[in-house]
Interface confidence: low
Amino acid sequence: QLPPGKPEIFKCRSPNKETFTCWWRPGTDGGLPTNYSLTYHREGETLMHECPDYITGGPNSCHFGKQYTSMWRTYIMMVNATNQMGSSFSDELYVDVTYIVQPDPPLELAVEVKQPEDRKPYLWIKWSPPTLIDLKTGWFTLLYEIRLKPEKAAEWEIHFAGQQTEFKILSLHPGQKYLVQVRCKPDHGYWSAWSPATFIQIPSDFTMND
């Protein structure tokens, strides 16, 4: 039996700058039961704290709730792996919440074929921002991207929607069934996952003629 291998903190993400979660990969366990603890201190402080919540983020994770999350202070964190033979430590990881935001996917994706009498027909796509994000304060700017493709096609067609929460698409293949998804990202941070796909049948008489 050996002391445990070196763990690695490989990812930290925040859904909204108010909370965040970090995940680590355990090293080898040295053939013995191994306990993991995450400790951290804030920039300029020497007092160490233990992870406030090992449950919410799933296995090998640490979740920082609202009361533990500060925008203005860098977190310096480390994972300690301990078994009967000894302890091993991850490299220290420096986390600034501003740069790890990954929102939840947009909600309430609605897709509709519009065929006005006097204009070209189009596909109208509408969605809502994720609930955890409060856009009214101006604290967040969310950007959106739409992707769609005929059901049996391999390639996605991608449209950047900017900050708007609805979008029109004119060029579509009549008679095809399309999959539509939307995702979002903050001005600094990561794209969300794609929303669940919404399906829409394009009528056979959908025409692009003037």
């Epitope: 700058k17 920039e43 300029g44 402080e45 020497t46 925008m71 203005w72 202070r73 860098t74 310096i76 220290e92 420096y94 600034d96 501003t98 304060t137 101006g138 604290w139």
Partner: antibody, heavy 118, light 110 residues
């Protein structure tokens, strides 16, 4: 006594360079984030740059980004500010300040300042 | 132009109470701690209030800070001649990733 002492200021031509130093004493320098703040003659305070205790996190004001470089030598208890491509608008008294450990983001100790004239 | 807005001047007579305001936005005062600094003529700034309303040791309890929404204020009661100075508010700005200061308020004791 906790003290910060800046040096390296002086008169420099536009486009020139200067390196400011800030010698710290009376506290464990390597445990604290450090900052540079400047004050143009007759004007208010302007934050310039910050560096974390281990130099892993560094921030700059947009007005100096790409021209100024903050660094520190924890073994010498010294903070530096390398200023390149200096402009007339960089003329100011430059203060170094300590990031307050328990004091919620405050700059709790300030040096006496060093004057840079471009 | 400063990100945080302060009145350029304020005045009062000895013994009076004076308040200095500091207005910001959701990305600085609205979501982070406010700090106040005092700068006496010809000297370096000195920390006066941190964490919205906390006084470092050595600062008289005549000085108090408060914060509401995206604004903050510094109150000085029992004004004294030695309080004549420039006062600056400051906060971390999460959108700019840096500290922002108010333009400063020159306090005159009449």
């Amino acid at each position: 006594e906790v003290q910060l002492l800046e040096s390296g200021g002086g008169l420099v031509q536009p486009g020139g360079s200067l390196r400011l130093s800030c010698a710290a004493s009376g506290f464990t320098f390597s445990s604290y984030a450090m900052h540079w703040v400047r004050q143009a003659p007759g004007k208010g305070l302007e934050w310039v740059s910050s560096i974390s205790s281990s130099s892993s996190s560094i921030y700059y004001a947009d007005s100096v980004k790409g021209r100024f470089t903050i660094s520190r030598d924890n073994s010498k208890n010294t903070l530096y500010l390398q200023m390149n491509s200096l402009r007339a608008e960089d003329t100011a008294v430059y203060y170094c300040a300590r990031g307050g450990g328990q004091q919620l983001g405050a700059f709790d100790i300030w040096g006496q300042g060093t004057l840079v004239t471009v | 132009q400063s990100v945080l807005t302060q009145p350029p001047s304020a005045s009062g007579t000895p013994g009076q109470r004076v308040t200095i305001s500091c207005s910001g936005s959701s990305s600085n005062i609205g979501s982070n701690f406010v700090t106040w600094y005092q700068q006496l003529p010809g000297t370096a700034p000195k920390l006066l209030i941190y964490g919205n309303n906390n006084r470092p040791s050595g600062v008289p309890d005549r000085f108090s800070g408060s914060k509401s929404g995206t604004s903050a204020s510094l109150a000085i009661s029992g004004l004294r001649s030695e309080d004549e100075a420039d006062y600056y508010c400051a906060a971390w700005d999460g959108s700019l990733s840096g500290w922002v200061f108010g333009g400063g308020t020159k306090l005159t004791v009449l």
